[in-house]
């Protein structure tokens, strides 16, 4: 059951007039412009700033009063500022959405420590994995390491968005009181949608200070 709660002063359930709502889109996938309405008989027009009107054809672009405009196979043509417009009692209402291309590009992945890593037993291991991506990309970063089953490592993550042309993701792996069982291959894996990159380093453990 879907219940409409009619409100003549508010034709859209969510109104984004101050700042557009960001919608991440991927070419070839379904894109929903979620300007659902408070009454099923409200007529809504979808405009692409500044010159175009997107006409629902019942196939590629469908209007559903409970969801909004459904674009079954989004293309680059739908990237930009999209506005849903409705006129109620002579008053024009607008709600705005900014579609943003979701990319899956991973520019670079690095472990910022010398290779191989040489460490004294009992000392702390810190490995910093850095992934660089375009601005409109998100990633998942995971580690695999020798004593993973005992969850020996703690992992901290952060993102640096101060660069105006790229996102830099950090994943810092820390293991206290390194033992012989912790020696071996440490791999940082970075995934963004179908894209995947990994980088690894070998960690050697020594008993005495003759490294």
């Amino acid at each position: 059951i879907y219940i409409f709660i009619s409100d003549t002063g508010r034709p859209f359930v969510e109104m984004y007039s101050e700042i557009p709502e960001i919608i991440h889109m991927t070419e070839g996938r379904e894109l929903v412009i979620p300007c659902r309405v408070t009454s099923p008989n409200i007529t809504v027009t979808l405009k692409k700033f500044p010159l175009d009107t997107l006409i629902p054809d019942g196939k590629r672009i469908i209007w559903d009063s409970r969801k909004g405009f459904i674009i079954s196979n989004a293309t680059y043509k739908e990237i930009g500022l999209l506005t849903c417009e409705a006129t109620v009692n002579g008053h024009l209402y607008k709600t705005n959405y900014l579609t943003h291309r979701q990319t899956n590009t991973i520019i670079d992945v690095q472990i910022s420590t010398p290779r191989p890593v040489k460490l004294l037993r009992g000392h702390t291991l810190v490995l910093n994995c850095t992934a660089t991506t375009p601005l409109n990309t998100r990633v998942q970063m995971t580690w695999s390491y020798p004593d993973e089953k005992n969850k020996r490592a703690s992992v901290r993550r952060r993102i640096d968005q101060s660069n105006s042309h790229a996102n830099i993701f950090y994943s810092v792996l820390t293991i206290d009181k390194m033992q012989n069982k912790d020696k071996g291959l440490y791999t940082c894996r970075v995934r963004s949608g179908p894209s995947f990159k990994s980088v690894n380093t070998s960690v050697h453990i020594y008993d005495k200070a003759f490294i």
Epitope: E18, I19, L51, D52, Y76, K77, I79, G80
Partner: antibody, heavy 116, light 110 residues
């Protein structure tokens, strides 16, 4: 890094023609609407024309309508402005501009001088 | 004559707060987003404010924008000598399908 490099400006006689080009790099060119904006010597900014990202729609200021034509070639990451029937008042620096949040990124401009 | 109206000049001393106004109509500022541009002497314009009050990354928070009805304004607090530039407002005009600019405001830091 977004880069917009205009070319094609120069000195032309009244009634003559010029074709400006803008080569774009550092972003997915076909995703964005593009503008041409001009600035006459010592004057303010004047919008000239816009083209939508797929090239299907265009608009022009009244001062250039019927004389200028904006176009783009997404396969070449290039924007163009064909200027015909040039007048002295078209003398300006012409900027190629990427449009998304606003007029986000500007080229350094190319100078057009219309004089006999 | 520009469709959007700005004062031709404004001035202030370092550290002061200065406001530049931009007045338009129902078909431009009244129904669309306003953006502001800074043009330093001899350089291309740069986006300073978009969507009425949003700042691009890299623009100091000393710059702020606002909009009310058919008018908008740009405020610069903690004025610095490097803020000396020309400032332009702009908006799309629905009625005639054109971008409209203000005439520009020359800001002088005394």
């Amino acid at each position: 890094e977004v880069q917009l490099l205009e070319s094609g400006g120069g000195l032309v006689q009244p009634g003559g023609s010029l074709r400006l080009s803008c080569e774009a790099s550092g972003f997915i060119f076909r995703d964005y609407n593009m503008n041409w904006v001009r600035q006459a010597p010592g004057k303010g900014l004047e919008w000239v024309s816009i083209i939508t990202n797929d090239g299907s729609s265009t608009a022009y200021s009244d001062s250039v309508k019927g004389r200028f034509t904006i176009s783009r070639d997404n396969s070449k990451n290039s924007l163009y402005l064909q200027m015909n029937s040039l007048r002295a008042e078209d003398t300006a620096i012409y900027y190629c501009v990427k449009v998304y949040y606003g007029m986000d990124d500007w080229g350094q401009g190319t100078t057009v001088t219309v004089s006999s | 004559q520009s469709v959007l109206t700005q004062p031709p000049s404004a001035s202030g001393t370092p550290g002061q707060r200065v406001t530049i106004s931009c007045s338009g109509g129902s078909s431009n500022i009244g129904s669309n987003y306003v953006s502001w541009y800074q043009q330093l002497p001899g350089t291309a314009p740069k986006l300073l404010i978009y969507f009425n009050f949003q700042r691009p990354s890299g623009v100091p928070d000393r710059f702020s924008g606002s909009k009310s009805g058919t008018s908008a304004s740009l405020a610069i607090s903690g004025l610095q000598s490097e803020d000396e530039a020309d400032y332009y407002c702009a908006a799309w005009d629905d009625r005639v399908n054109v971008w409209v600019f203000g005439g520009g405001t020359k800001l002088t830091v005394l």
